[in-house]
């Protein structure tokens, strides 16, 4: 449900579906790249799966010398720290033999810092966003996305990895946070709650949304995820809140309609290529940005988070499908897969628009307590 204060013209108000900003329906790919000798000349390899650490499953990108890289999926397991009143109690732990990083879970033992010391870092994610305290930064220009429109073939891999549903993205999806801040999309995944319980990771003035999408990107300055982990700006995540609206979201339906096929943990299916950008809000100019971490172990810091001001609207039925279809390990439902919000510890969240200006009649004077730091530094 939307809070009464979430108005169309206020921060984080207004979904991107309906007449205002329809989410265009497209397709989604995942056979990955082409063959070469075992993969034809000049083509890319199909991603192979290997277990390594990271937020959701971070793909590994080949060095540039090996052509525009294809992705190797590494199961970067996930767990979350307790502490949020709505934190899940019983789900989404990983259980892989011989892997010390496998016993993750949301809201239970082991404590995350024991799994990865970085999880006890000072600049962690997610955080609570307080628009009134955000620093308006005019230097934050509209995000640029290129190559996010994909034909139906090759298909894309959609997987229930036990802690989220993840879509592996092919090479060539380029995103720029600004001049010289260029990234390539690797994968996207979702976080959600349970019936009547919201499950976004970030919150706004303490308000938790029904769900949240994360599109994970690797800086073009790095060839591999493991090189970028912990490096400032090495990874960037685009995040958008999902909330309930009156109509079915056709872009999301292309994924949600396939969830029954991957209800079991570790199962996967192939979905036709689609317009990945249609899963995001249409307004790329209004967003919040801060430096944080992966929200799952290894909780590596230096991640640039961009949280859209505009939300994405899904129907009640679609939100129910998302939160009530997948299963984690054992007999536990895959639900409430979000981490508790973490302290800012002095960090200032920047806004690309004057988010601190309250448009309601109550605000006589605009309040903007923090000033903008130089963007792109």
């Amino acid at each position: 449900q939307r809070l009464p204060r979430m108005q169309e013209d206020s921060p984080l108000g207004g979904g991107s579906s309906g007449e205002d900003d329809p989410l265009g329906e497209e397709d989604l790919p995942s056979e990955e790249d082409s063959p070469r000798e075992e993969d034809p000349p000049g083509e890319e390899d199909l991603p192979g799966e290997e277990d390594l650490p990271g937020e959701e499953d971070l793909p590994e990108v080949k060095p540039k010398s090996e052509e525009e890289g294809s992705l190797k999926l590494e199961d970067l397991p996930t767990v979350e720290a307790p502490g949020d009143p709505q934190e899940p109690q019983n789900n989404a732990h990983r259980d892989k033999e011989g892997d010390d990083q496998s016993h993750w879970r949301y809201g239970g033992d082991p404590p995350w810092p024991r799994v990865s010391p970085a999880c006890a870092g000072r600049f962690q994610s997610p955080v609570d966003i307080r628009p009134q305290l955000a620093a308006f930064c005019p230097a934050l220009r509209p995000l640029e996305l290129l190559g996010f429109q994909l034909p139906p073939l090759p298909e894309l891999r959609l997987r229930n990895n036990g802690h989220s549903v993840q879509l592996t993205l092919p090479p060539g999806l380029e995103m720029a946070l600004g001049p010289g801040r260029e990234y390539r999309a690797l994968q996207l995944h979702l976080h959600w709650g349970a019936a009547g319980r919201p499950g976004s990771e970030h919150t706004v003035e303490g308000h938790r949304f029904p769900a949240e999408i994360h599109v994970v990107h690797l800086s073009t300055a790095f060839a591999r995820v493991d090189e970028a982990l912990g490096r400032p700006g090495g990874l960037a995540v685009l995040a958008a809140f999902l909330e309930e609206g009156p109509e079915e979201n056709s872009a999301y339906e292309q994924l949600l309609s396939r969830l029954e096929e991957i209800a079991e943990e570790g199962s996967e299916t192939q979905v036709p290529g689609l317009d990945i950008s249609a899963l995001l809000p249409s307004d790329f100019s209004r967003y919040f940005q801060y430096e944080g971490s992966l929200t799952t172990p290894p909780c590596a810091q230096g991640v640039i988070w961009t949280v859209f001001n505009q939300t994405v609207m899904l129907s009640a039925k679609q939100l129910h499908t998302l939160s009530d279809t997948l299963w984690g390990p054992g007999d536990s439902r895959l639900q409430l897969n979000f981490r508790a919000t973490q302290p800012l510890n002095g960090r200032v969240i920047e806004a690309s628009f004057p988010a601190g200006v309250d448009s309601s009649p109550r605000a006589a004077e605009p309040v903007q307590l923090n000033s903008c730091l130089a963007a792109g530094d």
Epitope: E32, E44, L46, G147, P151, P152, P154
Partner: antibody, heavy 119, light 111 residues
Framework: EVQLVQSGGGLVQPGGSLRLSCAAS????????MSWVRQAPGKGLEWVSA????????YYADSVKGRFTISRDNSKNTLYLQMNSLRAEDTAVYYC????????????WGQGTTVTVSS | QSVLTQPPSVSGAPGQRVTISCTGS?????????VHWYQQLPGTAPRLLIY???NRPSGVPDRFSGSKSGTSASLAITGLQAEDETDYFC???????????FGGGTKVTVL
């Protein structure tokens, strides 16, 4: 060596049927989407049909919908195109092509096989 | 009539630069779908020359380059050589037709 070797072309009367085959080698055939593309004499290229890696999804050009059927046997590394109710305008060189390229390009092509529909 | 429009022919002297245009619409190139280019020598199958608007498969000389803007794309050949005299096709995907689409082809002549 990565290659696609085609067979099955020939002369057929209008209304007749023909089955084209495309045998793949040198790469993991079952991991890639495949297509058929044709070229009428002296003309340009026209996409005909496509099939996903596992064979679960198929796509057809409007000009052949309901008459042609694409299929694959991943255990035999072979792609097929069953052509029924053939018309004179189906006369062309038919190419099988791998469209597993991540951006939708056709990166590996068969040598082509000629289909002539004439009475 | 092809969905993507190419000039029937272009020509240039050896060593010169020639460009081939490929014009589409809001349901293919303009919708954000990538453009790919193929070279077809007489009597042979097409060969992928440029994929993803501006990427060259290994083995393709760097004399060939691609670009895309709005609803059109172009292929540039610099340092034109005699062996470049052949046919070139652009290709994309069209969401309205739900089909992979090609241009009509351009014959490059080396003077």
């Amino acid at each position: 060596e990565v290659q696609l070797v085609q067979s099955g072309g020939g002369l057929v009367q209008p209304g007749g049927s023909l089955r084209l085959s495309c045998a793949a080698s040198g790469f993991t055939f079952s991991s890639y989407a495949m297509s058929w593309v044709r070229q009428a004499p002296g003309k340009g290229l026209e996409w005909v049909s496509a099939i996903s890696a596992n064979g679960g999804t198929t796509y057809y050009a409007d000009s052949v919908k309901g008459r042609f059927t694409i299929s694959r046997d991943n255990s035999k590394n072979t792609l097929y195109l069953q052509m029924n109710s053939l018309r004179a305008e189906d006369t062309a060189v038919y190419y099988c092509a791998n469209n597993g390229n991540y951006r939708g390009a056709f990166d590996i092509w068969g040598q082509g096989t000629t289909v002539t529909v004439s009475s | 009539q092809s969905v993507l429009t190419q000039p029937p022919s272009v020509s240039g002297a050896p060593g010169q630069r020639v460009t081939i245009s490929c014009t589409g619409s809001s349901s293919n190139i303009g919708a954000g779908f990538d453009v790919h280019w193929y070279q077809q020598l007489p009597g042979t199958a097409p060969r992928l020359l440029i994929y993803g608007n501006n990427n060259r498969p290994s083995g393709v000389p760097d004399r060939f380059s691609g670009s895309k803007s709005g609803t059109s794309a172009s292929l540039a050949i610099t340092g034109l050589q005699a062996e470049d005299e052949t046919d070139y096709f652009c290709q994309s995907y069209d969401s309205s037709l739900s089909a992979w689409v090609f241009g009509g082809g351009t014959k490059v002549t080396v003077l």
